[in-house]
């Protein structure tokens, strides 16, 4: 049994009240395992975005190496995010608005050469990561897909899709897609030759649209694409409207595998206030599906508070010295150094996460049911078979609520328990690994809790 | 194969100059910050400059700051170390090296050495 | 400055032995140290990266652990081409690149 632990007992007569009971074998086998569904390598975990990789590398000593060659030495670091794939650029040549200066097949030199690409792919299967390559084409300009000449950009992509499937890249990603005309069926192409070359690389395709109804037409032709979208963002961070856009969207798509974030590009404090982002990196990690993270996610990175940076790719913080622009305007805690050190800061709950999403089965794959708790709460269970469970408890208000689960609403085979234990809090100072009564929970003020209970059967 | 290769040392006088060059090849040179670090006879190794890949940011240890220069010309796969108002405590082989970035998390596999070239200053 | 000290200064062994050399640093560098081997007249070769991970090439007889400010090299069991000086080096934050002062590992 994959990873099931059926606990063997020996049947005493006292179990049996004193009786003398015939109990056949077919009583005493384990239930039948469920069959574990077909899982590629974007089902296992997170996707880190870096779309923009000279603000990636930091500025100062960090800024030592062309970007590419630069990411090769975070690699590491990367790894100890445990996230499974990298979606790195657009990185090839593009002159501003002018298609025949946008080469999908050359690498722009200041991000480094081709070489250094290749060592990059090569670096990163080493270490379990995969890399997928942004081919939005006029990434430097107006219109990303220069609206006057859309077939001569289709035919650039296809030449360019074939050409890094053979250089080994293990995916693609497109942006603002609400851009490009007859969208579905360039995408529907696009797959056709990202499946064809193997069923184990991706496409990945991003639209700024928040409206069901757009990205379910973009979904509906395209089997297995990933679209990554606005549509979260909508939520106005409640939490009954979020539960609500989240059912909608996986009973509207038929529980098909999906994609969680907040937009196609943007880092999470573009759309929330800082005492948002662990409720939310709880959420993006536990619902069904592929979370999908910018760089500067982990840590809170934020634009706002970084003097003279752009929005969309403000400067990432490895210490003190990456933003060496402004003295003392980068604190210890703002920084991936600082917080590497620090159990209780929003990089290691995200190692956190990232470690449980990919490896607990019930979070890989399992059974989502969302049910209902009390004003601004969203909860849920994720189950698979005999695997142990997960309880999921967001409390996006502002203030204390009792949790007040309502388990009638779930199927019998999600019951709630009385207790489960606590796995963690967003918020400190509740003791992990504790058993929490359900009846009495009780959530701070945008606190969220991860809690995990055994299959029962 | 990776390769680095220092010239330009020699005896000179304190209060002169030196010009010191490091060859590389076998890899993507333009790619790459690059180091002097110097070892003085009979002692430790001493790290000295760094140069970013573009030439855009460089950092020097405090004992040459304003005395010595580092430079590169990615077009000749070449760095430099001018240094000048030499004195009797800059006696050291001098090694260029790749050694990757001194930021947190930062861990290069891109490390190589020189074999070094000698500077003796002494009057 | 990031202070590096390594010790012992110097050690004599025997080829087979197990030997452990130590470095301190005088503050946390977290995991962000290297180890390089020198022979006399010779370049320093890199051994270890990140405080424990091997340099591909380097003999599994190798191995480095520690983090914070605490560091060990140890090599397992010695062979005669592992006589030579050690340093540690820490690559933590900002320059400068710091050097312990080395340790002479020498034939008993």
């Known amino acids: 049994h994959h990873h099931h632990h059926h606990e063997q007992k020996l049947i005493s007569e006292e179990d049996l009240g004193g009786e003398q009971k015939l109990i056949s074998e077919e009583d005493l086998r384990a239930p039948r395992c469920r069959e574990l569904p077909a899982q590629k390598w974007w089902h296992t975990g997170a996707l880190y975005r870096i779309g923009d990789l000279q603000a990636f590398q930091g500025h100062g000593a960090g800024n030592l190496a062309a970007p590419i060659s630069g990411l090769k030495g975070r690699l590491d670091y990367l790894s100890s995010l445990k996230v499974k794939g990298l979606v790195l650029g657009p990185i090839h040549k593009n002159q501003k608005d002018d298609v025949a200066q946008t080469d999908l097949l050359q690498i722009d030199p200041n991000f480094g050469s081709k070489e250094d690409f290749d060592s990059l792919l090569q670096s990163a299967k080493k270490k379990s990561i995969r890399v997928i390559l942004d081919l939005t084409p006029n990434y430097r300009g107006e219109n990303s897909w220069f609206s006057t000449q859309v077939d001569t950009v289709a035919t650039k992509v296809k030449d360019a899709l074939e050409f890094w499937l053979q250089a080994g890249v293990d995916g693609f990603q497109v942006r603002d897609i609400e851009n490009l005309k007859d969208a579905s069926s360039f995408l529907a192409e696009w797959q056709n030759i990202t499946k064809g070359f193997s069923e184990d690389r991706l496409l990945i395709a991003g639209t700024n649209s928040s409206d069901l109804q757009q990205i379910l037409s973009l979904l509906e032709s395209n089997k297995d694409l990933l679209l990554t979208s606005s549509y979260l963002s909508d939520s106005g961070s409640t939490g009954e409207h979020t539960k609500s856009l989240v059912t909608q969207y996986l009973n509207a798509t038929g529980n098909r595998w999906c994609s969680w974030s907040l937009s196609q590009a943007r880092l999470l404090t573009s759309f929330l206030p800082a005492q948002l982002l662990r409720l939310y990196q709880l959420m993006l990690f536990t619902l069904p599906g592929t979370p999908v993270f910018s760089y500067g996610d982990e840590i809170g990175l934020d634009a706002a508070a970084l003097p003279g940076q752009p929005m969309e790719a403000p400067v990432m913080l490895w210490d003190e010295s990456s933003f060496p622009d402004i003295p003392g305007a980068v604190s210890a805690n703002m920084t991936v150094k600082g917080q590497s050190e620090d159990p209780g800061s929003l990089l290691s709950l995200f190692r956190r996460l990232s470690d449980q999403r990919s490896k607990e089965r019930s979070l890989l794959h399992g059974d989502f049911h969302a049910f209902s708790a009390g004003p601004g709460l969203f909860s849920y269970i994720r189950h698979w078979d005999q695997n142990e469970r997960f309880l999921v408890v967001l409390n996006f208000g502002d203030v204390g609520l009792s949790a007040g689960l309502q388990a009638s609403d779930l199927p019998a085979s999600a019951s709630l328990p009385a207790k489960a234990d606590l796995l963690l809090s967003t918020q400190p100072g509740r003791e992990e690994g504790s058993p929490l009564e359900l009846e009495r929970l009780k959530l701070e003020p945008h606190e969220g809790l991860l809690l995990r209970f055994p299959y029962a059967a | 194969q990776v390769q680095l290769v220092e010239s330009g040392g020699g005896v000179v006088q304190p209060g002169r100059s030196l010009r010191l060059s490091c060859a590389a090849s076998?890899?993507?040179?333009?790619?790459?910050?690059m180091h002097w670090v110097r070892q003085a006879p009979g002692k430790g190794l001493e790290w000295v400059a760094l140069?970013?890949?573009?030439?855009?940011?460089?950092y020097y240890t405090d004992s040459v700051k304003g005395r010595f220069t580092i430079s590169r010309d990615n077009s000749k796969n070449t760095l430099y170390l001018q240094m000048n108002s030499l004195r009797a405590e800059d006696t050291a082989v001098y090694f260029c090296?790749?050694?990757?970035?001194?930021?947190?998390?930062?861990?290069?596999?891109?490390?190589?050495w020189g074999l070094g070239t000698t500077v003796t200053v002494s009057s | 400055d990031i202070q590096m000290t390594q010790s012992p200064s110097s050690l004599s062994a025997s080829v087979g032995d197990r030997v452990t050399i130590t470095c301190r640093a005088s503050q946390s560098i977290s995991s962000s140290l290297n180890w390089y081997q020198q022979k006399p007249g010779k370049a320093p070769k890199f051994l270890i990266y990140?405080?424990?991970s091997l340099q591909s090439g380097v003999p599994s007889r190798f191995s480095g652990s520690g983090s914070g400010t605490d560091f060990t090299l140890t090599i397992s069991s010695l062979q005669p081409e592992d006589f030579a000086t050690y340093y540690c080096q820490q690559s933590y934050s900002t320059p400068p690149i710091t050097f312990g002062q080395g340790t002479r590992l020498e034939i008993k």
């Open positions: 990140a405080a424990s």
């Open positions: 090296a790749s050694l990757g970035a001194p930021t947190y998390s930062y861990f290069s596999d891109m490390d190589v």
């Open positions: 140069i970013s890949y573009d030439g855009s940011n460089k």
């Open positions: 076998g890899f993507t040179f333009s790619s790459y910050g």
